[in-house]
Interface confidence: medium
């Protein structure tokens, strides 16, 4: 239904305390330098002007579409060229072409120093003196590093690091009780980052098509009770709030988001026996609960696919008749009975069905031709499989450090030209997989891996689309999402790349790594294993691990030592002369 | 180069006939599946029947069936779509197209105005 004024539509929908999350996080996120201060003024501004709207609905710039009223809000902030360069270009621009230019303008990558948190008796004086400012701060902070953060789950995360500080606040070891559990909020919302920016990846390089097929299969592995008619019902709305989001329509998706957590809630029997628990939460833990709620128990008499899509003599006939619909039935009826796949690897398996049934019933005898395509799958559900078994087996030997560092040797191998920070964070995300995938259950491993790892390439894929420099992750890069993860898997030593010479500085180090935390430590080490790969990308594994060992001998003895700055000035060189030995 | 070159287009009354001939020339004609797909004033392109390559399986969207037929002469390389029956809600640039219902080359179109 149309209303008056838009802005007290949500604002009356959503309630003052989640308008002006949402609001917050959708400035940050345009205007990702501007301090906390500069934001919080603007969504006082706007929170205020939605309270005379909602007084009035009748009152002057009410009826403005929020578009125009966030981006004439953007557009007013004094020295928006000074700060932001060409982004203030886009204020010349009219609604919806402003509102499309700030998107173009989000970075993905901005030049933010890392978020760091505070001591545990600082964060709690502040959290206790004002805690609407301090999970402001939060908001913001979150925001403007992971510019297409989903809003409302970026609101379910502050109520969460909400209620830890309320806590353990309260008890007297502050520090212990906060820092576990704050740790396992960030790596929740993290991975909760990566596969947002997965999707609004999807929904802007292949549209909503694409996305929708990715939210069929997805939910039908989830719901494998509910009808086609009720996946596709819950898809389309799925579809609607993800692009709201990724389009920076915050308040609509939050809204959207609510509605259809009420909708799943009030239509449980037709869609699923395990979702009374998520129902039982207030909204915000609701939505979150639903998101990644358990799979329901499949239905036991489920008949054998190839009845309807390869035994059926119509199947032509009806594939020619209701393309999308007879594809997606069949991507819905194979997702129902495979929650052990990954979305990427049922997505792939409806594309290479596609391809047959476009093939086969173009020829004289198509039974015949389309007869073996399930057996044609096969290959396709192999190398997942053997990918997952592989490198499981891996960091069960290895271990997290030791697997991320065999990652970043594999990966500086197929793509040297890519600078050393981003092949470090890349290869660390993509090892954290073991520690979050490889100890689940047997049928769980390969969705969590594949799902995962195809969200971190599609960062790194972003990462390079703003400086190209390897030519094997752009083509891995162009093609479509779920061939991404399989094409970086089957990249091998970058045979045209020219060694880099070896600088003695890159592998110098001062005592100041002694006191780092472990974390940075680590990344110190990975920075200098990636170099040497790039020094020498086709070092066996032996040569490598000798030198590293080495390394870690070298700073264990020097970190040991009495004089540290004369251990590190004088076993340094020697180090660098074995090393270069050792590759020789 | 694939080319497809559509003709037949034109004003007809409500209940009248035309008969569209597509061309086709830069690619192996009787390996292919053809179709038409056609495109309302104002609106997206809606699928309208699909011919398999050697001319044996013929499919129809239900608001052309028994009225529209499709058929070809792989001798000739031509499709050609048959349209009786016509009505007003027919109106739209027609386009012959190579492919069975995942179209990879498309002609320019034909336009074909029922109108009384």
């Known amino acids: 239904e149309a209303h008056k004024s838009e802005i007290a539509h949500r604002y009356n929908d959503l309630g003052e305390q989640h308008f002006k999350g949402l609001v917050l996080i959708a400035f940050s996120q345009y205007l990702q330098k501007c301090s906390y201060d500069e934001h919080a003024k603007l969504v006082q501004e706007v929170t205020d002007f939605a309270k005379t709207c909602v007084a009035d609905e009748s009152a002057a710039n009410c009826d403005k579409s929020l578009h125009t009223l966030f981006g004439d809000k953007l557009c007013a902030i004094p020295n928006l060229r000074e700060n932001y360069g060409e982004l203030a270009d886009c204020c010349t621009k009219q609604e919806p072409e402003r509102n499309e230019c700030f998107l173009q303008h989000k970075d993905d990558n901005p030049s933010l120093p890392p978020f760091e948190r505070p001591e545990a008796e600082a964060m709690c004086t502040s959290f206790k003196e004002n805690p609407t400012t301090f999970m402001g701060h939060y908001l913001h902070e979150v925001a403007r590093r992971h510019p297409y953060f989903y809003a409302p789950e970026l609101l379910y995360y502050a109520e969460q690091y909400n209620e830890i500080l309320t806590q353990c606040c309260a008890e007297a070891d502050k520090e212990s009780c906060l820092t576990p559990k704050l740790d396992g909020v960030k790596e929740k919302a993290l991975v909760s980052s990566v596969r947002q920016r997965m999707k609004c990846s999807s929904m802007q390089k292949f549209g909503e098509r694409a996305f929708k097929a990715w939210a069929v299969a997805r939910l039908s592995q989830t719901f494998p009770n509910a009808d086609f008619a009720e996946i596709t019902k819950l898809a389309t709305d799925l579809t609607k709030v993800n692009k709201e989001c990724c389009h920076g329509d915050l308040l609509e998706c939050a809204d959207d988001r609510a509605e259809l957590a009420k909708y799943m809630c009030e239509n449980q029997a037709t869609i699923s026996s395990k979702l009374q628990t998520c129902c039982d939460k207030p909204l915000l833990k609701k939505a979150h609960c639903l998101s990644e709620v358990e799979h329901d128990t499949m239905p036991a008499d489920l008949p054998a696919i190839a009845a309807d899509f390869v035994e059926d003599q119509e199947v032509c006939k009806n594939y020619a008749e209701a393309k999308d619909v007879f594809l997606g039935t069949f991507l819905y009826e194979y997702s129902r009975r495979h929650p052990d796949y990954s979305v990427s690897l049922l997505l792939r398996l409806a594309k290479k069905y596609e391809a047959t049934l476009e093939k086969c019933c173009a020829e004289a005898n198509p039974p015949a031709c389309y007869g073996t395509v399930l057996a044609e799958f096969q290959p396709l559900v192999e190398e997942p499989k053997n990918l997952v078994k592989t490198n499981c087996d891996l960091y069960e030997k290895l271990g997290e450090y030791g697997f991320q560092n065999a990652i970043l040797v594999r990966y500086t191998q197929k793509a040297p030209q890519v600078s050393t920070p981003t092949l470090v964070e890349a290869a660390r995300n993509l090892g954290r997989v073991g520690t979050k995938c490889c100890t689940l259950p047997e049928d769980q491993r390969l969705p969590c891996v594949e799902d995962y790892l195809s969200a971190i390439l599609n960062r790194v894929c972003l990462l390079h689309e703003k400086t190209p420099v390897s030519e094997h992750v752009t083509k891995c890069c162009s093609g479509s999402l779920v061939e991404r993860r399989p094409c970086f898997s089957a990249l091998t030593v970058d045979e045209t790349y020219v060694p880099k010479e070896f600088k003695a500085e890159t592998f110098t180090f001062h005592s100041d790594i002694c006191t780092l935390p472990e974390k940075e430590k680590q990344i110190k080490k990975q920075t200098a294993l990636a170099e040497l790969v790039k020094h020498k990308p086709k070092a066996t594994a032996e040569q490598l691990k000798t030198v590293m060992d080495d390394f870690a001998q070298f700073l264990d003895t020097c970190c040991k030592a009495a004089d540290k700055d004369t251990c590190f000035s004088t076993e340094g060189p020697n180090l660098v002369t074995r090393c270069k030995d050792a590759l020789a | 180069e694939v080319q497809l070159l559509e003709s037949g287009g034109g004003l007809v009354q409500p209940g009248g006939s035309l008969r569209l001939s597509c061309a086709a020339s830069g690619f192996t004609f009787d390996n292919n599946a053809m179709g038409w797909v056609r495109q309302a004033p104002g609106k997206g392109l809606e699928w309208v029947s699909t011919i398999s390559a050697n001319g044996n399986a013929t499919y129809y969207a239900d608001s052309v069936k028994g009225r529209f037929t499709i058929s070809r002469d792989n001798s000739k390389d031509t499709l050609y779509l048959q349209m009786n029956s016509l009505r007003a809600e027919d109106t739209a640039v027609y386009y012959c197209?190579?492919?069975?219902?995942?179209?990879?080359?498309w002609g320019q179109g034909t336009l074909v105005t029922v109108s009384s």
């Open positions: 197209a190579k492919g069975f219902r995942r179209f990879d080359y």
